[in-house]
Interface confidence: medium
Amino acid sequence: MIPTFTALLCLGLSLGPRTHMQAGPLPKPTLWAEPGSVISWGNSVTIWCQGTLEAREYRLDKEESPAPWDRQNPLEPKNKARFSIPSMTEDYAGRYRCYYRSPVGWSQPSDPLELVMTGAYSKPTLSALPSPLVTSGKSVTLLCQSRSPMDTFLLIKERAAHPLLHLRSEHGAQQHQAEFPMSPVTSVHGGTYRCFSSHGFSHYLLSHPSDPLELIVSGSLEDPRPSPTRSVSTAAGPEDQPLMPTGSVPHSGLRRHWEVLIGVLVVSILLLSLLLFLLLQHWRQGKHRTLAQRQADFQRPPGAAEPEPKDGGLQRRSSPAADVQGENFCAAVKNTQPEDGVEMDTRQSPHDEDPQAVTYAKVKHSRPRREMASPPSPLSGEFLDTKDRQAEEDRQMDTEAAASEAPQDVTYAQLHSFTLRQKATEPPPSQEGASPAEPSVYATLAIH
């Protein structure tokens, strides 16, 4: 049994278990998977489709499938249906949508759910060069090696929010390894890492995870990791920055982020003090008020948030702590020659709502080249469509991603960091424990 660990894939595998309902006569249903959308081979998974109380039947369709995948009658109170996969195999990996039928007709399709299976290939090996014991400020490269040639490598840090780096070599060039350079190393980089490998032609199939690699950072200052209870809307700490490549100048990024962190802590302490002061004042005043007045205080004003339902059965599978603690870095890397320039394309998911600093990179050839026609990879972030560059170019940094041991296979990329903005949309109706305040763009990589 693979040990359970959680990290969020930068591609937004299932866009979280909740998707927005749309207004109209037949709102689209929501689709999610339990215990998560990334399942190891042989394990069971349940797909849920939630529509309305008027639903008479639910239908699950798998993308690129010639027939309805499954159909189910609704469970009482008729607003959802369960589709069970008793044993995860390659056949079940893929992209799903669901519909429901009401007396009016069939609904719009749900947002897609992408079911990923791990255990499709033998596990790669993960090692650290020159050593897993590294001094703060120095460089280290994590090396993920597979026995057979693969074209996608994914590095995961346990309890981190996103894959640290996702290297994808395209144009059919397959390699036995991928290098993930980190420089300069800080205490933030310490922890347990694993890597996966995959083939581009089967985007929903990952290898077994590598054995864990413990990266120990010595001689470092106190761990600057923010508190697990930190709100997702606070300023991004150093952990939200991408890993720095060897020899790159981080534009004083780390020092500036220490300053930001200290500033945030100071402001937090001040706000906390102010809050305590106000509470104390309120409590003092409250002692001299009538019971009726006090009761009036506790009545919810119009428009105030409804209390969350207690049913925890349908809550997100990602912990709030995990949601904000990753080195948020994801790159789709194409095989290039050294003389090739690269242009950066910063993309943002149409569903992006987490105001976390996340760096996405898609590396393109600047010289015209025939692209391979392939569906967007759920691991590469290629489906993230908006080319809206945020006005945060001051945070840009040079980085390099080595996709193989061959010198000609090194791709140099200019990464533009941007902050995901809160969309000006109404929060979805609170549904059975889903917190509208914390919508996640990412699916939990929970290996069960």
């Epitope: 027939a67 309805p68 499954d70 159909r71 069970s84 056949d91």
Partner: antibody, heavy 120, light 115 residues
Framework: EVKLVESGGGLVKPGGSLKLSCAAS????????MNWVRQAPGKRLEWVGD????????NYSPSVKGRFTISRDNAKSILYLQMNSVKSEDTATYYC?????????????WGQGIQVTVSS | QSILTQPPSISESLGSTARLTCTLN?????????IYWYQQMAGSVPRLFLY?????????GPGVPNRDSGSKDTSKKAANLQISELQVEDEAVCFC?????????FGSGTKVTVL
């Protein structure tokens, strides 16, 4: 008239290769998933594999996976089945079949079938 | 063992009703499946006989008479095909079929003989 006509069958030695073709007429070929289904003498129908409309997806029965390849030419309205490393158990009548493609998705048009015999 | 099990043959007298069963194995729920019945007469090509999901969601194949109907027995994990008022021309092999895990699966077929 909607019609599917198979060709290319015959006798082939074990380990050998054979390519079947299916010419479609009377309908918009590129709008349908297409299938190959086979039937050994006196036996059940056995689905071989299918291909989607725009040639991006193929699925195969476990018994032929890795040996058979389905392809199509939408411009010519032809479906192909490339059979490699054939075995004696591949001996059957091979039908070219159209998937109706609505949410019912049944096989609504069948070719007359072509005989493939694997024997040394 | 096949996913779909059918009895090899059934014999019924002219004008009576033939009931064919198709049992789903491997833990597959019949409730959520579209069931397809194909009929193959001797020396002929198979044709769709009946598509059945529920009484409100079914379709007879082209030229198939209205005396044929489908049903499901969820407790027995079985799909049923009923051919009433049997005629001589109903003599054929009937195959049930489902779509499961990226593949189409056929039952072994039931030979219907009209006495």
């Amino acid at each position: 008239e909607v019609k599917l006509v198979e060709s290319g069958g015959g006798l082939v030695k074990p380990g050998g290769s054979l390519k079947l073709s299916c010419a479609a007429s009377g309908f918009m070929f590129s709008s349908y998933w297409m299938n190959w289904v086979r039937q050994a003498p006196g036996k059940r129908l056995e689905w071989v594999g299918d291909i989607n409309k725009d040639v991006t997806t193929t699925n195969y029965s476990p018994s032929v996976k890795g040996r058979f390849t389905i392809s199509r030419d939408n411009a010519k309205s032809i479906l192909y089945l490339q059979m490699n490393s054939v075995k004696s158990e591949d001996t059957a009548t091979y039908y070219c079949v159209r998937n109706h493609g609505s949410r019912y998705a049944y096989f609504d048009v069948w070719g007359q079938g072509i005989q493939v015999t694997v024997s040394s | 063992q096949s996913i779909l099990t059918q009895p090899p043959s059934i014999s019924e007298s002219l004008g009576s009703t033939a009931r064919l069963t198709c049992t789903l194995n491997n833990g597959i729920s019949v409730g959520g499946k579209n069931i397809y019945w194909y009929q193959q007469m001797a020396g002929s090509v198979p044709r769709l006989f009946l598509y059945y999901y529920s009484d409100s969601d079914k379709e007879l194949g082209p030229g198939v008479p209205n005396r044929d109907s489908g049903s499901k027995d969820t407790s027995k994990k079985a799909a049923n095909l009923q051919i009433s008022e049997l005629q001589v021309e109903d003599e054929a092999v009937c195959f049930c079929s489902i779509y499961e895990s990226n593949t189409w699966v056929f039952g072994s077929g039931t030979k219907v003989t009209v006495l």
